[in-house]
Amino acid sequence: QGGAAEGVQIQIIYFNLETVQVTWNASKYSRTNLTFHYRFNGDEAYDQCTNYLLQEGHTSGCLLDAEQRDDILYFSIRNGTHPVFTASRWMVYYLKPSSPKHVRFSWHQDAVTVTCSDLSYGDLLYEVQYRSPFDTEWQSKQENTCNVTIEGLDAEKCYSFWVRVKAMEDVYGPDTYPSDWSEVTCWQRGEIRDACAETPTPPKPKLSK
């Protein structure tokens, strides 16, 4: 996502509208402590980063507190006083929502409703992926709110579930990041399990009356 200037590649991640992480990869300056200077308003003076990320003892990024900033980030990566990369970006296009919290499962016969706390901002998709040991791939269902009902499940099978949040591409564009997945939880017959057996257990024979 970062255009190269003097061989500098940048990556921006805006964590849940709270923290911006800008990292750089500059082969030409691999043994140099580049400095990061930023502002949130085009007519302010630049501030220098106070929270650097280090790689092999050298600066490789900066973490900025940007809680609920509705802004453009103006920044300059410098070698001493010499700018090696200068740019400005709307931060929102690099959004990474936080992982779903308070995930709950409500079972009713062959269906489960997965809920979690909606984030404070909109235009998001809440995606639930699930599979049983019989499935070769994860199945997926997503909704605009964290209230996702999955039907047609087999009550006898054990299912693994996890949930994540994605920014809608039509609104936020292609450069956002999905949230980290929630922890995997396993369910069988409406009850939580430690794990689902990796090899599917053969179905119990039906007893004739």
Partner: antibody, heavy 125, light 106 residues
Framework: QVQLVQSGAEVKKPGASVKVSCKAS????????ISWLRQAPGQGLEWMGW????????RYAQGFTGRFVFSLDTSVSTAYLQISSLKAEDTAVYYC??????????????????WGQGTLVTVSS | DIQMTQSPSSLSASVGDRVTITCRAS??????LAWYQQKPGQPPKLLIY???TRASGVPDRFSGTGSGTDFTLTISSLQAEDVAVYYC????????FGQGTKLEIK
């Protein structure tokens, strides 16, 4: 439906001030940011900046600080642009435009779906 | 600033023609590009965003392509009502517009 209705044309003398209004309807005013843009006669479009209608926080583009002030009256769903110490080169059509997609909780991001009809400000002695 | 350069600055074509307008950004803007149509005495109208997504209600004869620095707006079959000035606009950072392309009917 979403509408942005601007105040009428103004003729001002150099050094005077002008205040252009932009009344929004058809949506919750505080949900989307309002940008101001200008178009000098026969020229292209320039973005002047935007105001977050949720926080009231204005942001000015380079070249539009000092004499230009964005303000709001959320009780009447109206945004204002005030220009002081007018110069001949301020003669232009001024537009308000609503961010089309990104809500104010998140920010503005420069895609203008809804526009006012424009207000011509003429500065002449 | 990110400079946006449009070409041509004006063009004349016949009804039914395929028309192409190009826009070049001074730096990589990925797909953060919009196209607007402005008719005389009217505000601009959003046609395309994300370089290729048609805005609601825009006829499908309008299409956009491109990413990075080079972008194209195509009108597949020109109609009389398409006479207007067309602007590209980047929104990677604070918005900047191309100088416009004036489209006329022969």
């Amino acid at each position: 439906q979403v509408q942005l209705v601007q105040s009428g044309a103004e003729v001002k003398k150099p050094g005077a001030s002008v205040k252009v209004s932009c009344k929004a309807s058809g949506y919750t005013f505080t949900t989307y940011g309002i940008s101001w843009l200008r178009q000098a006669p026969g020229q292209g479009l320039e973005w002047m900046g935007w105001v977050n209608t949720n926080t009231g926080n204005p942001r000015y583009a380079q070249g539009f600080t000092g004499r230009f002030v964005f303000s709001l009256d959320t009780s009447v769903s109206t945004a204002y642009l005030q220009i002081s110490s007018l110069k001949a080169e301020d003669t232009a059509v001024y537009y308000c435009a609503r961010e089309g997609f990104i809500t104010t909780v998140v920010g503005a991001a420069g895609r203008f779906v809804y526009w006012g009809q424009g207000t011509l400000v003429t500065v002449s002695s | 600033d990110i400079q946006m350069t449009q070409s041509p600055s004006s063009l004349s074509a016949s009804v039914g023609d395929r028309v192409t307008i190009t826009c070049r950004a001074s730096q990589d803007i990925h797909t953060r590009l919009a196209w607007y149509q402005q008719k005389p005495g009217q505000p601009p109208k959003l046609l395309i965003y994300w370089a290729s997504t048609r805005a609601s209600g825009v006829p499908d004869r309008f299409s956009g392509t491109g990413s990075g620095t080079d972008f194209t707006l195509t009108i597949s079959s020109l109609q009389a009502e398409d006479v207007a000035v067309y602007y590209c606009q980047q929104y990677s950072t604070y918005p900047t517009f191309g100088q416009g392309t004036k489209l006329e009917i022969k």
